[in-house]
Structures are given as structure tokens and as C-alpha cells.
Interface confidence: medium
């Protein structure tokens, strides 16, 4: 006769481990007794189970309430048992030695390996303005065992570095994605792939990139030189710019309070029908957290009763 | 050949404990599973618990929790704590062991009474 099991046994941590020990014999060869040990490097070999064709199954009280034999129907040469809830401490050599009349007793190891998934954290890195050099974007930490694969998933460019520490029992891997900020990454998701034979599918973390900006400013409303004539209504600036944060925007007038009547609505100042008095220097300012910016406009409101006067169009930043 | 030799036995109220104990002529080691059965009068033999030579405890159902097999090889010696003694429990107690050589050699102790009282 022979014994049939096998050389490794996989099991995810939480879950039931059967452990395989099958007597292959003659007709009328019978199982005595099945006996199931913990074999240690350190303690040696310890009893965890034996299954007993008379008195039935014994377990160690140290596995108490764990150890089972699989479910009916059962065949009397199979002496497997189940482990159940198997932990990381589980992990090692089990040895199964099957005691037969006549042909004696056998025996086998076999090695237990519990998968114990990562749980993978992503912490974004210091927050992210254009014009910096090299930055940490985000690192990405896992810990199980055995070590888990940790890599990116994203159409920005920039580099990954990993590092892995070795526990007992496990070992954590934290890798760190490294890029040069521009507003183009704004708002472009890095995900953390996280891989692990533990897993039935990679886990995966997304962080949003936030990257800190602000665009030089403009203003637009004077290209249309016959709005900007007395008694026209409806004339109006707008300041042109963009930012993240988003931007705030402030109008003031060089040479003076802004004329009665000029209304300011976030990045637009709005004009009542136009009178000379309106000619002057408009100023649009532009702040966010990391910046700001100024771009001003000469406005001359032109007299369709004065024909030696045309409207003057000069932008400067 | 095993001699067996039980002791511990006697008149107990219900709700009470005893402790049984079982006493082989040679090393325990090489004695596989060690038990007990009883015997009440006028009723066949009942399996009790057994323990084996690692430590390993099976318990029939009716006093899983009650009773604690344990052994100490050492001293070749085989123990039944009973607690919570009920009037049922009343038998003769027999200790068992188990031999496997070329096939398995089962001896038998001379047992000893117990009396559990309501």
C-alpha cells in the first residue's frame, strides 16, 4: 500500500486547511489509527489528532474545537482532517502516519503555508506644486505573506521606487511613485496595485493628483473696438486665467475708484452705458493658495461726437 | 501482557466530583490510546473517553464537559476527573489501554464503583 497526499497545503488565512492523508492498500488491508502530528524544528514533533477506527477521533486540547474530520461520507482508509480557521502560526511541517493490518504503518509530510492577504494603504505625499522638482506623489504600503506585489497603474510619467522589511511572519512592501509636477497631471488618477496569491483579484487604491497652479492672466472684452463707444451698453471685461485652487478674482481701477454703476461678478466687470468716464487703467487680479497674478487694460470710451478721438487699445501684464 | 489497576472509586452525592485513576504495569508511551468505560447494572459497557499517547482527549456526549481524561506518562498513570456527578453516572468504571504491535492488543483494568446519590 501507499500513502496519497500532498506536499504542500494552501490555505488563505481565516479559512479551512484539509490536510490529505489517504491509504491506497489491498481489499483486505484496514486502517487502525491515523495519527496526525505538528512537526517543529524547535518542539520537535507534537500530537495534534488521531483518528481511531475503534475509539474515533482524539484531538490535542491545544487544537480544541479545531481540528475535525471532513464531512460524510467518509471512507474508512482516508484519514484527513480539517484545520479549521487557519492562522499564521499554523504555517509549517504536519507529518500523517497511518497505522495498517498487515502491512504495518506509513507515514508522510507535508509542508501548511497560509496566505495571509495584504490589507494595502496609499498616503499621498506633500501637497503637489508646478514647478517643484522631484516630488513624492503618494506611497503605497502592504503587508502579508508571502510579500505582496506592489506597483502603479497611470498614464502620468514619472518613477516608482519599492522597498520591502521582512518580519517573522510577513513582510511589508512600500512603493513610492516620484514625479515633477505640471498642471497637466491635475486632477489624473495614480492607482496602487496591490498583488498577492492570497488575493482572487489585485487590490487596488486610487489616489486623484492634485497639483497646486496658477496660469498667467489675461483680459478679454476690448477686441471689438465699436462696443467701447459712449452710450453702448452691454460692454464688459473678462479676466482670463485658470488655477488649482481654483482661483479668486479681484477688479480694481489704477487711476481711481471703479466709476459708479460698474458692476464686479467674479472674473467679469460689467459696464452701464458707456460714458468718457469710464476711460481708465482696470486692473484684474488673480489669487489662489499658491499664487497670484495681475494683468491691467487702458479702456478709452470713445465719443462718436468727437471724431478726432479713437478708441486707444493697450493691454499690458 | 498490561495489568491495570483502577482506584478512586465511591459513594458521591449528585453534583458532586471524583477523581479515577488507572495505574499500568509498564511505560505508557508504548501504550497507544488509554481510556475508560463503565458499566451500569443490568446495561452493556458504555465508552466513557480515551486519551492518547500525545495527549489527544475524545469524550462520549453524555459527559463532554463534565469529565477530563488526562494521563501522565511518567508515572504510567491514566486519570478521570467527574464533576458534576449525576445519579446516572453510577457504573462500574473500567480503565482500557491499547497496544499496537502487529495489530492492536486492547487490556482491561478489574474496574471500580462508583455511587453517585440523589
Known amino acids: 500500500g501507499e500513502l496519497e497526499t500532498s506536499d504542500v497545503v494552501t490555505v488563505v488565512l481565516g479559512q479551512d486547511a484539509k490536510l490529505p492523508c489517504f491509504y491506497r492498500g489491498d481489499p483486505d488491508e484496514q486502517v487502525g489509527q491515523v495519527a496526525w502530528a505538528r512537526v517543529d524544528p524547535n518542539e520537535g514533533i507534537r500530537e495534534l489528532a488521531l483518528l481511531h477506527s475503534k475509539y474515533g477521533l482524539h484531538v490535542n486540547p491545544a487544537y480544541e474545537d479545531r481540528v475535525e474530520q471532513p464531512p460524510p461520507p467518509r471512507d474508512p482508509l482516508d484519514g484527513s482532517v480539517l484545520l479549521r480557521n487557519a492562522v499564521q502560526a499554523d504555517e509549517g511541517e504536519y507529518e500523517c502516519r497511518v497505522s495498517t493490518f498487515p502491512a504495518g504503518s506509513f507515514q508522510a509530510r507535508m509542508r501548511l503555508r497560509v496566505l495571509v492577504p495584504p490589507l494595502p494603504s496609499l498616503n499621498p505625499g506633500p501637497p503637489l506644486e508646478e514647478g517643484q522638482g522631484l516630488t513624492l506623489a503618494a506611497s503605497c504600503t502592504a503587508e502579508g505573506s508571502p510579500a505582496p506585489s506592489v506597483t502603479w497603474d497611470t498614464e502620468v510619467k514619472g518613477t516608482q521606487s519599492s522597498r520591502s522589511f521582512t518580519h517573522p511572519r510577513s513582510a511589508a512592501v512600500t512603493s513610492e511613485f516620484h514625479l515633477v509636477p505640471s498642471r497637466s497631471m491635475n486632477g489624473q488618477p495614480l492607482t496602487c496595485v496591490v498583488s498577492h496569491p492570497g488575493l482572487l483579484q489585485d487590490r487596488r487604491i486610487t489616489h486623484t493628483l492634485q497639483v497646486a497652479f496658477l496660469a498667467e492672466a489675461s483680459v478679454r472684452g476690448l477686441e471689438d473696438q465699436n462696443l467701447w463707444q459712449v452710450g453702448r451698453e452691454g460692454a464688459t471685461l473678462k479676466c482670463l486665467s485658470e488655477g488649482q485652487p481654483p482661483p479668486k478674482y479681484n477688479w480694481t481701477r489704477l487711476d481711481g475708484p471703479l466709476p459708479s454703476g460698474v458692476r464686479v461678478k467674479g472674473d467679469t466687470l460689467g459696464f452701464p452705458p458707456l460714458t468718457t468716464e469710464h476711460s481708465g487703467v482696470y486692473v484684474c487680479h488673480v489669487s489662489n493658495e499658491l499664487s497670484s497674478r495681475d494683468s491691467q487694460v487702458t479702456v478709452e470710451v470713445l465719443d462718436p461726437e468727437d471724431p478726432g478721438k479713437q478708441v486707444d487699445l493697450v493691454s499690458a501684464s | 501482557e498490561v495489568q491495570l489497576v483502577e482506584s478512586g472509586g465511591g459513594l458521591v452525592q449528585a453534583g458532586g466530583s471524583l477523581r479515577l485513576s488507572c495505574a499500568a504495569s509498564?511505560?505508557?508511551?508504548?501504550?497507544?490510546?488509554m481510556g475508560w468505560y463503565r458499566q451500569a447494572p443490568g446495561k452493556q459497557r458504555e465508552y466513557v473517553a480515551t486519551i492518547t499517547s500525545g495527549g489527544s482527549t475524545n469524550y462520549a456526549d453524555s459527559v463532554r464537559g463534565r469529565f477530563t481524561i488526562s494521563r501522565d506518562n511518567a508515572e504510567n498513570t491514566v486519570y478521570l476527573q467527574m464533576d458534576s456527578l449525576k445519579p446516572e453516572d453510577t457504573a462500574v468504571y473500567y480503565c482500557?489501554?491499547?497496544?499496537?504491535?502487529?495489530?492492536?492488543?486492547?487490556?482491561w483494568g478489574r474496574g471500580t464503583q462508583v455511587t453517585v446519590s440523589s
Open positions: 482500557t489501554a491499547e497496544l499496537v504491535r502487529r495489530g492492536p492488543t486492547t487490556y
Open positions: 509498564r511505560s505508557t508511551f508504548s501504550l497507544n490510546i
